[in-house]
């Protein structure tokens, strides 16, 4: 089972956490797919980008996403870790100047064009069950993760440990 403990515990700390550097600590390009190996693709339609979850044809090229990793420091009184209470936050950009955003009101994941510094809605706390299998939790809404619903990306509330095993919030990163 995939597990993420303490979803409720650190709600305040997550809201209060700050990105420690303006620059990402690392960046790399990867294709994003679901736990069930469907590809996340991006298409320009009517001057805006749409996000799809779909099976690709055999030789069809996967879309790449630029993952930028940022360190986020918990306030030491919240985390109990002093300087050691660090999280990794990521932003995901499939094309120049566009980033995935959490729309918490609509429970949706959208691509927005924006300039840096990016808004909090573009940052996701990274969780993983292994290096190449990850989940993305909204910085702005702890306990809410990017997930797959009806062949689209959506925001999914994970309210208990049992629900953390759910495959619809798991994504695979790969170079190909």
């Amino acid at each position: 089972a995939f597990g993420i403990s303490g979803v409720q515990k650190y709600t305040r700390a997550l809201h209060d956490s700050s990105i420690t550097g303006i620059s990402p600590i690392t960046e790399y390009l990867a294709s994003l797919s679901t736990y069930n190996d469907q590809s996340i693709t991006f298409a320009l339609e009517d001057e805006s980008y749409e996000i799809y979850v779909e099976d690709l044809k055999k030789d069809e090229k996967k879309d790449k996403v630029l993952l930028s990793y940022y360190e986020s420091q918990h306030p030491s009184n919240e985390s109990g870790d002093g300087v050691d209470g660090k999280m990794l936050m990521v932003t995901l950009s499939p094309t120049k100047d566009f980033w995935l955003h959490a729309n918490n009101k609509e429970h949706s994941v959208e691509l927005h064009k924006c300039e840096k510094p990016l808004p909090d809605q573009a940052f996701f706390v990274l969780h993983n069950m292994h290096s190449n299998c990850v989940s993305f939790e909204c910085k702005t809404d702890p306990g809410v993760f990017i997930g797959v619903k009806d062949n689209h990306l959506a925001l999914i509330k994970v309210d208990s440990s049992e629900n953390l095993c759910t495959e619809n919030i798991l994504f695979k990163l790969s170079e190909t």
Epitope: G3, I4, Y69, G82, L88
Partner: antibody
Framework: EVQLVETGGGLVQPGRSLKLSCVAS????????MYWIRQAPGMGLEWVSS????????YYLDSVKGRFTISRNNAENTVYLQMNSLRSEDTATYYC??????????????WGQGTLVTVSS | DIQMTQSPSVLSASVGDRVTLSCKAS??????LDWYQQKVGEAPKLLIY???NLQTGIPSRFSGSGSGTDYTLTISSLQPEDVATYFC????????FGQGTKVEIK
């Protein structure tokens, strides 16, 4: 201050069992992946096993799969390594380490001082 | 499985020298690479994470670089206290250490 203290090492005969413990303090234990890494005398480092922050996922080096079991008790800030069917090639100093970031399996930010396991008849 | 190969196995240099240690991965590891320092009789210590980020409290003479399969640890001015064995470590796919480079003072 982060502290990791390993205990449970010692001399054991081949085929027997041993359980290592690592007690953690100075950080929010339940938020971090934990690891066991070993080092045979005069040799390099070898990753042995990993456990995610809530204990739901465990990973093992191929040569210890089916013999070693990693577990954790978040209420007691302790991670364990149960070692069964020990072999002479398991002789090493066993280190406990904690992850660098909440919820992710990247980097070993802190290490304990290690406990020596000697498998010999 | 990803293999990590370090070179040289032993490096002998003078105090003040610029020293370069190499680590090669069998596959692209996307900068998911650390460097650890281990002094005789001590536990290893994290120096560099995600290829080029200096761990808190580590002197700035240590730096890391690289991408894809090739990575480097540089000590800009070797000090007597830098005598140790240095291990690279990848966590892009599974967890694997290199065999280590022993750094000595001439």
């Amino acid at each position: 201050e982060v502290q990791l203290v390993e205990t449970g090492g010692g001399l054991v005969q081949p085929g027997r069992s041993l359980k290592l413990s690592c007690v953690a303090s100075g950080f929010t234990f339940s938020n971090y992946w934990m690891y066991w890494i070993r080092q045979a005398p005069g040799m390099g480092l070898e990753w042995v096993s990993s456990i995610n922050n809530d204990g739901g996922n465990t990973y093992y080096l191929d040569s210890v799969k089916g013999r070693f079991t990693i577990s954790r008790n978040n209420a007691e800030n302790t991670v364990y390594l149960q070692m069964n069917s020990l072999r002479s090639e398991d002789t090493a100093t066993y280190y406990c380490a904690k992850g660098h970031y909440y919820y992710t399996s990247y980097s070993f930010a802190y290490w304990g001082q290690g406990t020596l396991v000697t498998v010999s008849s | 499985d990803i293999q990590m190969t370090q070179s040289p196995s032993v490096l002998s240099a003078s105090v003040g020298d610029r020293v370069t240690l190499s680590c090669k991965a069998s596959h692209n590891i996307n900068k998911h690479l650390d460097w650890y320092q281990q002094k005789v009789g001590e536990a290893p210590k994290l120096l560099i994470y995600f290829t080029n980020n200096l761990q808190t409290g580590i002197p700035s003479r240590f730096s890391g670089s690289g991408s894809g399969t090739d990575y480097t640890l540089t000590i800009s001015s070797l000090q007597p206290e830098d005598v140790a064995t240095y291990f690279c470590f990848q966590y892009n796919s599974g967890w694997t250490f290199g065999q280590g480079t022993k750094v000595e003072i001439k």
